[in-house]
Interface confidence: low
Amino acid sequence: KHKCFRKELEENETLESIMNTAESEEELKKYFYYLEGSK
């Protein structure tokens, strides 16, 4: 179960790194803070 959750996080991180533009680092930081908080 833990492995699956980690995989989901990795997929989300990849999606974020692709879809967020260089100009929206704040949005990206906020999202990673949310991820850290959900572990």
Epitope: N12, L15, S17, A22, Y31, S38
Partner: antibody
Framework: QVQLVESGGGVVQPGRSLRLSCAAS????????MHWVRQAPGKGLEWVAV????????HFADSVKGRFTISRDNSKNTLNLQMNSLRAEDRAVYYC???????????WGQGTMVTVSS | DIVMTQTPLSSPVTLGQPASISCRSS???????????LSWLQQRPGQPPRLLIY???NRFSGVPDRFSGSGAGTDFTLKISRVEAEDVGIYFC?????????FGPGTKVDIK
Amino acid sequence: QVQLVESGGGVVQPGRSLRLSCAASGFTFSSYGMHWVRQAPGKGLEWVAVISYDGNNKHFADSVKGRFTISRDNSKNTLNLQMNSLRAEDRAVYYCARGASGFVLDIWGQGTMVTVSS
Amino acid sequence: DIVMTQTPLSSPVTLGQPASISCRSSQSLVRSDGNTYLSWLQQRPGQPPRLLIYKISNRFSGVPDRFSGSGAGTDFTLKISRVEAEDVGIYFCMQTTQFPFTFGPGTKVDIK
């Protein structure tokens, strides 16, 4: 104004290769993720591939994985799609689109037609 | 993959009358960041797709206010309050919540 112009389409035999390009203007190209989306004649839209603003992250649809590669040259404001081992089902209009923050494809090119036929 | 469905697939409308298109996703489009990445695109005959609505209900710049989007989770709606001749075309919903990004089959809007 913000503009995307695709080129490189044409008629190609099955199994052969083709390289599409997308020239961007009117915005800071190096700040945006870029996508390819295709549309078979008379059909719906199919997302093909994306590349991050810096070129470090790429993702592909399963239907093209291992056959298509996506790249970009930020110094020339150009996006590329290298299509290898082409199949009849790859026949479509190929659009490039800009990926804005907010997870949205906000600007689209006019498209370039790829025909795969023997 | 997330499957997107649309109803109706064809919608003949009278000029000046409202039109409504429904889009449903096979799973929730709410991402872990709390946002729902559902867009609506318009494709006029012979033209490339054009963004109308993003994140369910946000109109893209230059889009007339007769277009509106609503919904949540797995069910979404695009409404045209008063159809004009230039609105003829195919309307697609699209999800960018999860790879691979997927589109609905499209709804053809034409004039009765």
